[in-house]
Interface confidence: low
C-alpha cells in the first residue's frame, strides 16, 4: 500500500512524463539516430524503456543523464512512432510520441546547357535536374563555383531552369548546379560543364 | 532477370594493357553505380574502384593512376581499361552492382561471373 | 579501411553452430556486408548494415554488431554452406568512397 501511496505522490510534480527527442528529426533510409529520453527529475535511478508502436526497443538505466538510444532507420514503417517509458520502482510516465520524416535524398543532379550565339551575345539556358529525392528539391546554379541564381524550389520532378545573357566571353566558364532537400546537411553537385572561350568555331552548345 | 557479364579477360604480357566490359541487362544501368573488384588465385577480394550515375570514379589508392572505369549508359555496358600491367594484377575481376538502396547502404547485391585475367611474360 | 577476419579457416561439422568475427581498423558504425562464395564462383551477399538478412537467405544466417567489431552466426551449419565467408565493410558519399573486404574464412568439413 506505501509503495502505491508513494506512486500516486510521485505522479504529481516529482514525476513528469520524459522528454523523447532526437537532434536529426529529417533522415535517410539506412541513416543512424540517437534518441534521447531524459527526464527532470535529475536524483532518481529511472529506467527508460524504447518503444516503437508497441515493440519494445531497448531499456536503459539513467540517474541525471538521458537514455541514448542508437538507431538505424532502414525502412519506412521505423519512423515511427516512438515513445520513452520512464519508470522508477513501480511508477511509469510516458512521453509524447515521436516520429521521424524519411527524405529520398537526392541524387547528382544533371547539368544541361543551351547556348543561343548572336554577334555579341550569348544567351544561356541552363537545366538542372535530379531524377531521384523526395520533393521539393531546391536548385542553385553556380557559375565559376559562384552562385548565380537564388534558390529554385520544384515541388515536381522537372528541371529547374535558370537563364543568363553574357558578352562573348574571352575566357572558358564552368557552370555547375547543385541540389538539395529537406536532408540537413545533405547536398549533390553535376558534374561540371565548360563553355569554351569565343574563339572559331568553339561553342558545342550553340544553337546558331 | 539482372544479369552482368564480364568480359575481354585473357592473357596479357607485363606492360600491356587490357579492356574489360560488363555487360548489364534486366535493370538501367543509368540509374545505378557499379564497381569492379578482383580475386587472385587463392586470394582475398579487392575493391578496386566504382562508378557513380554520373560518371564520378573512385579508386583504391593502389589502382589510381593504372585503372579506369567507364561506362556507356546507350550500351548497358561499364568497362575496366588497365594499363601497365604486372604479373601481381592477375585475377578473376568482377563487375558488381550497388544494391538499389541509398547511399550509405552501398554493398553489393548483384555480381557478374568473373573473367580471368593472366598477366604473364 | 582495414578488415581483418579470424578464424581465417575452420572446420566444421553439419549441424554445428559456426561464428565467424571481422574487426575493422576504424569505427564503421552498422555498414557491413557479409558475402558467401563458393570455388569458381561470385560471391553472394548474405548479410547487409550489419544484422539485416538479404532476401532469399535462410535465417539459420545471422549477424551482430557495430562500431569495429562484427560477427557472422550460422546457427546450424548446412551441407551447402561449406564455402568461404568474406565481411565487407562500405561507404560511399559525394566527396569519398572506398570499400573494403576482410581476407575470408574458409569453412570445410571436420
Known amino acids: 500500500r506505501k509503495a502505491v501511496l508513494d506512486c500516486e505522490a510521485m505522479k504529481t510534480n516529482e514525476f513528469p512524463s520524459p522528454c523523447l527527442d532526437s537532434k536529426t528529426k529529417v533522415v535517410m533510409k539506412g541513416q543512424n539516430v540517437s534518441m534521447f529520453c531524459s527526464h527532470k527529475n535529475k536524483s532518481l535511478q529511472i529506467t527508460y524503456s524504447l518503444f516503437r508502436r508497441k515493440t519494445h526497443l531497448g531499456t536503459q538505466d539513467g540517474k541525471g543523464e538521458p537514455a541514448i538510444f542508437n538507431l538505424s532507420i532502414t525502412e519506412a514503417h521505423e519512423s515511427g512512432p516512438y515513445k520513452c517509458k520512464a519508470q522508477v520502482t513501480s511508477c511509469s510516465k510516458y512521453s509524447r510520441d515521436f516520429s521521424f520524416t524519411i527524405v529520398d535524398p537526392v541524387t547528382s543532379p544533371v547539368l544541361n546547357i543551351m547556348v543561343i550565339q548572336t554577334e555579341t551575345d550569348r544567351h544561356i539556358t541552363l537545366h538542372c535536374l535530379s531524377v531521384n529525392g523526395s520533393l521539393p528539391i531546391n536548385y542553385t546554379f553556380f557559375e565559376n563555383h559562384v552562385a548565380i541564381s537564388p534558390a529554385i524550389s520544384k515541388y515536381d520532378r522537372e528541371p529547374a531552369e535558370f537563364n543568363l545573357t553574357k558578352k562573348n566571353p574571352g575566357e572558358e566558364e564552368e557552370y555547375r548546379c547543385e541540389a538539395k532537400n529537406r536532408l540537413p546537411n545533405y547536398a549533390t553537385y553535376s558534374h561540371p560543364v565548360t563553355m569554351p572561350s569565343t574563339g572559331g568555331d568553339s561553342c558545342p552548345f550553340c544553337l546558331k | 532477370e539482372v544479369q552482368l557479364v564480364e568480359s575481354g579477360g585473357g592473357l596479357v604480357q607485363p606492360g600491356g594493357s587490357l579492356r574489360l566490359s560488363c555487360a548489364a541487362s534486366g535493370f538501367s544501368l543509368s540509374s545505378h553505380a557499379m564497381s569492379w573488384v578482383r580475386q587472385a588465385p587463392g586470394k582475398c577480394l579487392e575493391w578496386i574502384g566504382t562508378i557513380s550515375t554520373i560518371d564520378t570514379t573512385y579508386y583504391a589508392s593502389w589502382a589510381k593512376g593504372r585503372f579506369t572505369i567507364s561506362r556507356d549508359n546507350s550500351k548497358n555496358t561499364v568497362y575496366l581499361q588497365m594499363n601497365s600491367l604486372r604479373a601481381e594484377d592477375t585475377a578473376v575481376y568482377y563487375c558488381a552492382r550497388l544494391s538499389e538502396l541509398y547511399t550509405t547502404n552501398s554493398y553489393y547485391s548483384r555480381w557478374g561471373q568473373g573473367t580471368l585475367v593472366t598477366v604473364s611474360s | 579501411i582495414q578488415m581483418t577476419q579470424s578464424p581465417s579457416s575452420l572446420s566444421a561439422s553439419v549441424g554445428d553452430r559456426v561464428t565467424i568475427t571481422c574487426q575493422a581498423s576504424e569505427s564503421i558504425g552498422s555498414l557491413l556486408a557479409w558475402y558467401q562464395q563458393k570455388p569458381g564462383k561470385a560471391p553472394k551477399l548474405l548479410i547487409y548494415r550489419a544484422s539485416t538478412l538479404e532476401s532469399g537467405v535462410p535465417s539459420r544466417f545471422s549477424g551482430s554488431g557495430s562500431g569495429t567489431d562484427f560477427t557472422l552466426t550460422i546457427s546450424s551449419l548446412q551441407p551447402e554452406d561449406f564455402a568461404t565467408y568474406y565481411c565487407?565493410?562500405?561507404?560511399?558519399?559525394?566527396?569519398?568512397?572506398?570499400?573494403?573486404f576482410g581476407c575470408g574464412t574458409k569453412v570445410t568439413v571436420l
Open positions: 565487407q565493410s562500405y561507404h560511399y558519399s559525394s566527396s569519398s568512397s572506398y570499400a573494403a
